[in-house]
């Protein structure tokens, strides 16, 4: 391992800020590779990462292009993927990404998938369908046109799909509240079966919302297909269009047929024969977590290494599992000392830095490296549609036809024991999704099913049931949730969404956006009620008072939650009240804190860390 | 010991066209961005154009942009300048100088190696 | 593009004195500053890097001090051979500029 010039930070407890984000994946996931690639060095030095939200930060997080305002300039796809300076005020500690690079998982474009039977997972590229091999969303087996794909590899096996973004499920922006195209549609007297670029000059593609763009003036621009934007060719930046003929044989996917070296490729028009129009299909892109972790070993005040096989060598390859190479262990302790792993049972407190934990054995990620080989040297650029950034997604309500088929809806009685996905045994479970008390008993969630601990002698565990059954809407895996001890309405969190129950009738979802948080929001940790109508509403270390009659929070109110709940840590993940006092869950732990939730004004001796447990053997009652 | 040679260098009509060569040695010059600087006679550093270690980005100053190309061969270490439509005002000697920095760790600022120049001189 | 001045334009001082050269950047670089000294007929040679770091093979008696848009080189105790221009370079904007040099001669 190699140090630069001896430089490091003076303090341990480290705070970055993602400044902006690349299209290419969601929010929530740049979010967590981020968080993943600072835990890495985390795990093995004693360092804590804290994000917060402002240009105070140690290591400000960007994407950039070209030119993107230091003396650095990217240099478009491939190549340079990202720099990081060494540490020190302004600039120095801060990590820069190329978003000319397709970021990924390591593994293929991320496509968010919407309805299906999946809960919004990812496609997975490539899936097999009907036995053959499918590296981009696909309309085969639909007749209406609407593209999917299977987010496990085998759709014949597994049955687990999604639709991908397209106008045939919702538009963005416009004027057309998110309504899906309406094809075909009449514009300036003409016909369009499918979006069009017609009437503007910027190049965005948009349709009408109604059948008669002329007469009611309705539109929205199309969701951008990342998975069918080709790269190279003679098309850059032109979507793939399936089916297409290629020496008179028809392709509903990307093929390698007719090249020597096994790329990818698509037609840009239905019949390449005729028109020559082509481009490459979207390649593995890089993952965004192995050059981050990369990135922020720079930041944290290493160079690169002359192990191949270590983190901070400076070539990129794909790499599975945990990335760090006793080289790049001995260079962080080098600098930072020696990390200390935590007991098994918690302590009485813990501070309000990040615990950052360990980031799953086995990752699907890659190493960065600076120069990897040279791919195609054109790609498309990607230019950000008009408007807001959050988008509604309506979609069908009906059953999708002959492709992959729907869930079964299921009745809204609490189904009892049926098989079970997680383990029987509530004991088994590391980590619940969500815990909250329900009716006067505490609900434990986890993957789409729960279990009710009654606090009375006998047997006071009930389950498993079924989630869907209870509340319909609901996707199988939750954030959090929180029943408003007035009205007894309970709230459901999930990723940016929220659903809220009064009995069997359900509000939602709705996005984080209308409760007045913003996009860097990814998820809510739970509530806590407060006097009659509020409660407190956390989020990743911050917390805001949250009006449970008009749905909004106070933007003024957030405040870093040490300020209130000291000893708790930062990164709850599951917040809930049970039998007046309030819960901090982390891992398989909780701290519990007197909560006094009566008063307008919190009283700071009150809210004191009075024990911590295991949520099962303490919670639970688990043998 | 790290070694930096231009050549090529000459008495050009304007309008006409030279092309700088510089052989690197003693560095792995594939890992290293690369630049020429100029410097006309009796005046100061100007930076001419810059490229990336792959050849895949290139960098030049407005006063040559659209007439001077830069390149690079790995395999044979050697950075150039192709230079046309040269004018009076290019006349001066062109180094060809080695980045500190390097891959993504950009810490590093200064050329640390430098050639030791070639007179080009444009002139009627 | 930032701009980079330095001051003076000549500076004569006799052998053992302390030599003083500045360089201001219109606008804030951190501490992406570096110092070259060429003496005539010859190529630049490169004394700082990063504001305050000497060169491999460069004299204790130069040093760099500064930050943001004020920087600083100060040659301790000068020798006949540290008689040269003496140029300042930014990166921390693109594009890179110099300074229009420092000419520091025998008095």
């Known amino acids: 391992f190699q140090t630069f010039k001896g430089l490091k930070w003076d303090h341990h407890n480290i705070t970055y800020w993602i400044q902006n984000y690349s299209e290419d994946l969601p929010r929530d996931m740049i979010d967590d590779a981020f968080a993943r690639a600072f835990a890495v060095w985390g795990e093995v030095a004693p360092l804590t990462f804290t994000r917060v939200y402002g240009p105070e930060a140690d290591i400000v997080i960007q994407f950039g292009v070209a030119e993107h305002g230091d003396g650095y300039p990217f240099d478009g796809k491939d190549g340079l993927l990202a720099h990081a300076f060494p540490p020190g005020a302004g600039v120095q500690g801060d990590a820069h990404f190329d978003d000319d690079e397709l970021w990924s998982l390591g593994k293929g474009v991320v496509i968010p998938t919407y309805y299906g039977n999946s809960n919004g997972a990812p496609c997975h590229f490539p899936f097999t369908f009907e036995g053959r091999s499918y590296s981009a969303c696909t309309t085969d087996g639909r007749n209406d046109g609407t593209p999917w794909c299977s987010t496990t590899a085998d759709y014949d096996k597994d049955g687990k799909f999604g639709f991908c973004p397209s106008e045939r499920l919702y538009t963005e922006h416009g004027n057309g509240e998110g309504k899906p195209c309406v094809f075909p549609f009449i514009f300036e007297g003409r016909s369009y079966s499918a979006c069009t670029t017609k009437g503007r000059s910027d190049g965005y593609r948009w349709c009408a919302t109604t059948a008669n763009y002329d007469q009611d003036k309705l539109y929205g621009f199309c969701p951008t297909r990342v998975d069918a934007t080709v790269v190279g060719g003679n098309s850059a930046g032109e979507l793939c269009v399936f089916p297409f003929v290629f020496l008179g044989k028809q392709y509903s996917s990307c093929t390698s047929d007719g090249r020597r070296d096994g790329r990818l490729w698509c037609a840009t028009t239905s019949n390449f024969d005729t028109d020559k129009k082509w481009g490459f299909c979207p390649d593995q892109g890089y993952s965004l977590f192995l050059v981050a972790a990369h990135e922020f070993g720079h930041a944290l005040g290493l160079d690169h290494s002359s192990v191949p096989e270590a983190l901070m060598y400076p070539l990129y390859s794909y790499l599975e599992g945990f990335p760090l190479n006793k080289d790049d262990i001995d260079g962080i302790q080098y600098l930072y000392g020696r990390g200390s792993k935590p007991d098994p049972r918690p302590p009485a407190t813990t501070t309000t830095e990040p615990q950052p934990t360990a980031p799953p054995t086995m990752c699907p990620t890659i190493p960065p490296t600076a120069y990897p080989t040279v791919g195609p040297t054109v790609g498309p650029t990607g230019a950000p549609s008009p408007g807001p950034t959050s988008s509604p997604s309506p979609g069908p309500t009906g059953a999708p036809s002959p492709g992959p088929t729907a869930p079964p809806t299921a009745g809204s009685s609490e189904a009892s024991t049926e098989s079970l996905s997680p383990a029987d045994n509530p004991c088994n479970v590391d980590v619940f999704d969500a815990i909250a008390e329900i009716q006067g008993a505490l609900h434990f969630f986890k993957d789409g099913w729960y279990w009710k601990f009654l606090n009375h002698r006998g047997s006071p565990l009930q389950g498993p049931f079924l989630t869907a059954r209870t509340w319909p809407a609901l996707p199988a895996t939750l954030d959090s949730a929180f029943e408003d001890p007035q009205t007894k309405r309970v709230f459901f969190f999930s990723g940016r969404q929220m659903w809220v129950y009064t009995g069997k009738t359900v509000l939602g979802p709705r996005s984080l956006d209308k409760l007045g948080l913003g996009p860097e929001v990814t998820h809510v940790s739970g509530l806590l009620p407060r006097r009659l109508g509020k409660a407190l509403l956390f989020s990743k270390g911050r917390v805001w008072r949250f009006d449970l009659k008009s749905q909004k929070v106070d933007p003024q109110s957030v405040i870093r939650v040490d300020k209130e709940f000291s000893g708790v840590p930062w990164n709850s993940h599951d917040i809930f009240q049970y039998q007046d006092k309030a819960y901090f869950c982390h891992g398989k732990f909780f701290w519990r804190v007197s909560f006094q939730n009566e008063v307008n004004k919190v009283d700071h001796e009150v809210n004191q860390v009075d024990d911590v447990g295991y949520v099962t053997y303490d919670l639970l009652q688990c043998p | 010991e790290v070694q930096l040679l231009e050549s090529g260098g000459g008495l050009v009509q304007p309008g006409g066209s030279l092309r700088l060569s510089c052989a690197a040695s003693?560095?792995?010059?594939?890992?290293?961005p690369m630049w020429w600087v100029r410097q006309a006679p009796g005046k100061g550093l100007e930076w001419v154009s810059s490229i990336y270690p792959s050849g895949g980005a290139t960098f030049y100053a407005d006063s040559v942009k659209g007439r001077f190309t830069i390149s690079r061969d790995n395999s044979k270490n050697t950075l150039y300048l192709q230079m046309n439509s040269l004018r009076a005002e290019d006349t001066a000697v062109y180094y060809c100088?080695?980045?500190?920095?390097?891959?993504?760790?950009?810490?590093?600022?200064?050329?640390?190696?430098w050639g030791q120049g070639t007179l080009v001189t444009v002139s009627s | 593009d930032i701009q980079m001045t330095q001051s003076p334009a000549t500076l004569s001082l006799s052998p053992g004195e302390r030599a003083t050269l500045s360089c201001r950047a219109s606008?804030?670089?951190?501490?992406?500053l570096a110092w070259y000294q060429q003496k005539p007929g010859q190529a630049p040679r490169l004394l700082i890097y990063d504001a305050s770091y000497r060169a491999t093979g460069i004299p204790a008696r130069f040093s760099g001090s500064g930050s943001g848009t004020d920087f600083t080189l100060t040659i301790s105790s000068l020798e006949p051979e540290d008689y040269a221009v003496y140029y300042c370079?930014?990166?921390?904007?693109?594009?890179?500029?110099f300074g229009q040099g420092t000419r520091l001669e025998i008095k």
């Open positions: 370079q930014q990166r921390g904007n693109w594009p890179i500029t």
């Open positions: 606008q804030s670089i951190s501490s992406f």
């Open positions: 003693g560095f792995t010059f594939s890992l290293y």
């Open positions: 100088a080695k980045d500190r920095a390097y891959g993504d760790y950009v810490g590093w600022n200064g050329f640390d190696y």
